[in-house]
């Protein structure tokens, strides 16, 4: 069969080889398409409800005024010339529709290096067959599931027209120290060959490099965290970051129910105050960062220095926040 590719909505003429150019003609068109269940026969004398889809012209050709998705299939003509010689024509018709230019929607203006970011969503509307969307970085194809690249795709079909809408969401993890203004674009490749790809306008988000955080320092007074019963311990959380983050306190891995403050004072230490303390600095841009943990212990009379692995009580005694 001869392969014919026709654009949806356009007219199509299929020639019936060997047919006399004018009536009377002995010819018959048979079609097996999405509009038929088996073969539908159309003759020159026909003329009826099928004319809106396909009709035989006076010269024996089959005329499709506006091809649709349902017209994909096989078209055959059997004609006999004036001498009784029979000629057969056989066509395989496939249809296509080029969508509008794809677009990138919900595009990010800024990406953060070292973490996954949504770059944007590429949308193509009105294609047939569906075709595919692909992403490019600086003109080179991006391969999903490689080097921090992931793509989420969705294909929808219009219930009435049968045309496809494609969506592709791109996520990337920019490398630290990489290109500060990468260029992303997306292209639609048609499902039928011999049609060039359609490319979106490029987008150029900025890549923001988070400054490596300096460690959160926890300073204990007295040094070592060992104190006599009734003594005072002062814990100071030092964070070099600007603006100053919020500081919360933890004891034995559990947040203390206190308002944020960079200084924690434990006056009149008792057994219940023993335990492991740390502070957590929460930055608006980086999330939480925890200090090292320090152990606060009570020196019983006659003991020297901090006791290893001392067990703290559950109470907090009296706390003072600077």
């Amino acid at each position: 069969a001869q392969n014919i590719t026709a654009r949806i909505g356009e007219p199509l003429v299929l020639k019936c080889k060997g047919a006399p150019k004018k009536p009377p003609q002995r010819l018959e068109w048979k079609l097996n398409t999405g509009r038929t269940e088996a073969w539908k026969v159309l003759s020159p004398q026909g003329g009826g409800p099928w004319d809106s889809v396909a009709r035989v012209l006076p010269n024996g050709s089959l005329f499709l005024p506006a091809v649709g998705i349902q017209d994909e299939g096989i078209f055959r003509c059997q004609a006999m010339n004036r001498n009784g010689k029979e000629t057969k024509s056989n066509y395989r018709v496939r249809v296509y529709q080029i969508p509008g230019k794809p677009e990138i929607v919900d595009s990010a203006s800024e990406l953060t290096a070292g973490v996954p970011n949504k770059v944007g969503t590429c949308v193509s509307e009105g294609s047939y067959p569906a075709g595919t969307l692909s992403w490019h970085l600086d003109g080179k194809p991006l391969v999903p599931n490689e080097k921090g690249v992931s793509v989420k795709e969705q294909t929808r079909r219009h219930p009435e027209t049968g045309l496809f809408t494609l969506q592709s969401e791109l996520m990337v993890t920019p490398a630290r120290g990489g290109d500060p203004r990468p260029t992303f674009s997306c292209s639609f490749s048609p499902g039928l060959p011999r049609h060039r790809a359609l490319r979106t306008a490029p987008i150029q988000p900025r890549v923001w490099e988070p400054v490596p955080l300096e460690e959160v320092q926890l300073v204990v007074e007295p040094e070592g965290g060992a104190v006599a019963p009734g003594g005072t311990v002062t814990l100071t959380c030092e964070v070099p970051a600007q603006p100053s983050p919020q500081i919360h306190w933890m004891k034995d891995g559990v947040p203390l129910p206190l308002p944020p403050s960079p200084v924690l004072i434990l006056p009149e230490i008792g057994p219940q105050d023993q335990g492991t303390y740390s502070c957590v600095a929460t930055h608006s841009s980086h999330g939480p960062q925890e200090s090292r943990a320090v152990s606060i212990s009570i020196i019983e009379p006659g003991e020297e220095g901090p006791t290893a692995g001392s067990v703290g009580g559950s109470g907090l005694g009296t706390l003072a926040l600077a």
């Epitope: 038929t36 409800p49 004319d51 889809v53």
Partner: antibody, heavy 119, light 107 residues
Amino acid sequence: EVQLVESGGGLVQPGGSLRLSCAASGFTFNNYWMTWVRQAPGKGLEWVASIDNSGDNTYYPDSVKDRFTISRDNAKNSLYLQMNSLRAEDTAVYYCARGGDIRVSLDHWGQGTLVTVSS
Amino acid sequence: DIQMTQSPSSLSASVGDRVTITCRASQDVGIYVNWFQQKPGKAPRRLIYRATNLADGVPSRFSGSRSGTDFTLTISSLQPEDFATYYCLEFDEHPLTFGGGTKVEIK
């Protein structure tokens, strides 16, 4: 909302003429074939005429061929049926309907207009 | 010309009954058959298109099926508003041909 409204029916003598109209709204008129169907009193439905969307091609059953002419004015969203040489057996309610080809067949109908052929 | 032989021409049924109406085409018409409902003094209303598809706004108790050149309209559970006359139509070839109609009456 699709609406089809027929008009022009009435009493006419045998051999006389009548022109029916159908005003269409609520859809893109020139995208559809249009059809006239009639129903004699107490009887079933009978196809009368169809026309393609451009108006270039018209179709009739033998019972009305050469007597009835279907036409359309896409600019006015209107369908017409010119009936000549009327006979008593043409007495019926005449309905205008959208479609008539294999893509869309009579999915919306007007309320009908009565044509009575009698002396 | 294609003949559409519709049966029965009338039937009596009660609310809740399952009702089946058949049309047989005299030759192959593919899937190109519609079913219509008509109430006295009103225009026909399309129920089923292309043999098996339910038209917009039509209750799901109506269904259409096809076996070769035999087409069937089924009302799974007859409701009071379903008492009417039903017609099939073939639109594969001209002349477009309607079945003779089936009047569904209250038993």
